[in-house]
């Protein structure tokens, strides 16, 4: 009786992983054994797949073949007993562009109100993705283990910490991978889960702020007691990219290491130009606090990020403030290349009672105030990139005084 | 493969100071932190201090401050550990070990045994 | 500086036992505790780090667990190597400290 060729063969690229899945087109024929070739483009010759010769069961691996990866490939299988099928041949592909993105690796580590997840490539040094390490970009599905209200969080890198959870709470997530560059998107990793710890005696340092005084930089936090020490510790922000290192080596501000303020002063010259990450450390002499959420800091941006320069135009029962360019020394605007937003303050002048407003345009009606009556604005800018979050300092306050009462037309 | 490899034994007299060497190999220092870990004899492990080669910052533990450095010559993959004013209470084992990922001293030398004595 | 007490400072199992070793740490670590093995005249070898990761290459007799202040190192069936001392060590601040040691003895 003639062997029937094998049909269906499918090929699962997972990683560095290369899978071969077949039908066997005659069940009924016992002890049949299963060969594949290989041709690569450009050439006439086939040549044996090791990994896949002689194979009694209906899968084999060819992983150990060293494939150019970007090259196209074409497979043929046939079916062997006493004789052999004719080949059927497979459509021919290229592994990179049919390759999946395997699961990562997930290392969990808990505070009492914050998750530090490590992610790594499923498989170290991969072939597959060797030019693109450090382009994979992360996403991850958390719920706590009670609830099971899902959270997703997208775009992330190697290292991310989850803030504002509960202490001694059980959280469970999983992570997948992302070559966002080639469209890929790649499978979750197992869930993992983790437990927060019983909450820290010392809070971390909160509301961590820079501004630009001179020639210096000025750091500021809130913190909840009196009496504490400060360290404040930087990092590269772009290492949090670096796929499989899972050293992070922060530095510390020399100027604002056991401090006893909650604010520290160090020159500009400290950090060359580009986007670093800051965080807070509190200590009671006996106890450490965990360390604070880390603020993006952008050299660049914090430098030019001057408070904004306004004109009020009075009225009886309110101000129109036109929010224009700051001023450089030297009176010439600062070209602003990226989106703000305005928060305008503003209180009667023999009040604290003061009141807030949020704007992206630049004239601005402060409404709802009583004739004669003097008021004080101030402003700062900030960006509207939720990842760097950067303000400006607020302007020095300006108080006016609105109208007598029939001029609010 | 990671290894590390100390100096040998040294008999020092109080007063004096000693230089225990540890060479890396099988990775790149600059990439790790390097630490000092002393065992006194039948005694526990004591974190002494680390350095971080690349460019050479250092942390020390209390107790150690002011009476060890450690240094560290990146073209040669060696870490060094200096001991000055020595005392009888400094005889011990001193290992260095390397700091990889999430700050785990992963890998260990052999020790270096150091005896203080007249 | 963080203070580790680790109990018990000795103790006596036989072959296929199951012991635990605890190790408290005097302030909140999260989950920043890791645990070597010694055996005399060896440098100490890694076995646990953050708490509950258990080294490549280590059996999976060896489990670690805890977070916080309390944490536990298991050996679920001990084979005639695992009689040597135990530390656990934290690295959540510096300095790092290790625990005292536990010395794990044949009965």
């Known amino acids: 009786k003639n062997l029937k060729s094998p049909q269906k063969v499918e090929v699962d690229i997972i990683d560095d992983n290369f899978i071969l899945r077949w039908n066997r087109s005659d069940e009924s024929v016992g002890n049949v054994t299963f060969s594949f070739d290989y041709q690569k483009t450009g050439m006439d010759n086939w040549i044996k797949l090791s990994g896949c010769q002689n194979i009694t069961s209906t899968k084999c691996n060819f992983s150990s073949l060293k494939l150019n990866v970007y090259e196209e490939i074409k497979l043929r299988i046939r079916a062997e007993k006493e004789n052999t099928s004719s080949w059927y041949e497979v459509d021919s592909f290229t592994p990179f562009r049919k390759a999946q993105i395997g699961p990562p690796e997930v290392h969990l580590e808990a505070e009492d109100k914050a998750i530090v997840i490590h992610i790594s490539p499923g498989t170290k040094d991969s072939v597959m993705w060797a030019l693109d390490g450090l382009s994979f970009t992360y996403s991850l599905v958390i719920w706590k283990n009670s609830s099971g209200v899902e959270e997703r969080i997208e775009n992330i890198y190697s290292r991310h910490k989850i803030y504002k959870l509960s202490p001694e709470t059980t959280y469970c997530l999983k992570v997948k991978a992302a070559l966002l560059t080639s469209w890929k998107i790649g499978v979750y990793s197992p869930v993992h889960c983790i437990k927060t710890t019983v909450e820290n005696e010392l809070p971390p340092p909160e509301n961590i702020e820079v501004s630009v005084q001179n020639q210096n930089y000025v750091l500021k936090w809130d913190y909840t007691y009196a009496n504490m020490t400060f360290q404040v510790q930087w990092l590269h922000a772009f290492l949090k990219r670096n796929p499989g290192n899972h050293l992070y080596k922060w530095k510390q501000i020399p100027d604002c290491e056991n401090v006893k303020t909650t604010q520290c002063v160090f020159p500009q010259n400290v950090f060359q130009k580009g986007i670093y990450l800051l965080r807070v450390q509190a200590s009671d002499g006996n106890n450490t606090s965990f360390w604070s959420e880390e603020i993006k800091f952008d050299t660049e941006i914090q430098a030019f990020l001057l408070p904004p320069v306004f004109n009020i135009r009075s009225l009886s029962d309110s101000f129109h403030i036109y929010i224009g360019a700051p001023k450089q020394s030297g009176n010439t605007p600062v070209i602003q290349d990226y989106p703000l937003i305005y928060e305008i303050i503003f209180w009667e002048n023999t009040s604290n009672a003061e009141r807030k407003i949020i704007e992206k345009k630049t004239d601005v009606t402060v409404p709802n105030l009583k004739p004669l009556t003097v008021y004080c604005v101030k402003a700062r800018a900030h960006t509207m990139d939720e990842k760097l979050n950067k303000s400006s300092v607020f302007s020095d306050a300006v108080c006016e005084k609105t109208k007598p009462g029939n001029t609010s037309k | 493969q990671v290894q590390l490899v100390q100096s040998g034994a040294e008999v020092v007299k109080p007063g004096a100071s000693v230089k225990v060497s540890c060479k890396g190999s099988g990775f790149n220092i600059k990439d790790y932190y390097m630490h000092w870990v002393k065992q006194a004899p039948g005694q526990g492990l004591e974190w002494i201090g680390r350095?971080?080669?690349?460019?050479?910052?250092?942390k020390y533990a209390p107790k150690f401050q002011g009476r060890v450095t450690i240094t560290a010559d990146t073209s040669t993959s060696t870490v060094y550990l200096e001991l000055s004013s020595l005392r009888s209470e400094d005889t011990a084992v001193y290992y260095c070990?390397?700091?990889?990922?999430?700050?785990?001293?992963?890998?260990w030398g052999q020790g270096t045994l150091v005896t203080v004595s007249s | 500086d963080i203070q580790l007490t680790q109990s018990p400072s000795f103790l006596s199992a036989s072959v296929g036992d199951r012991v635990t070793i605890t190790c408290k740490a005097s302030q909140n670590v999260g989950t920043n505790v890791v645990w070597y093995q010694q055996k005399p005249g060896k440098a100490p070898k890694l076995l646990i780090y953050s708490a509950s990761y258990r080294v490549s290459g280590v059996p999976s007799r060896f489990s670690g667990s805890g977070s916080g202040t309390e944490f536990t190192l298991t050996i679920s069936s001990l084979q005639p190597e695992d009689f040597a001392t135990y530390y656990c060590?934290?690295?959540?601040?510096?300095?790092?400290?290790f625990g005292q040691g536990t010395k794990l003895e044949i009965k």
């Open positions: 070990a390397r700091g990889g990922n999430f700050y785990v001293m992963d890998y």
């Open positions: 060590q934290q690295k959540n601040n510096y300095p790092y400290t």
């Open positions: 350095i971080d080669p690349e460019d050479a910052e250092t």
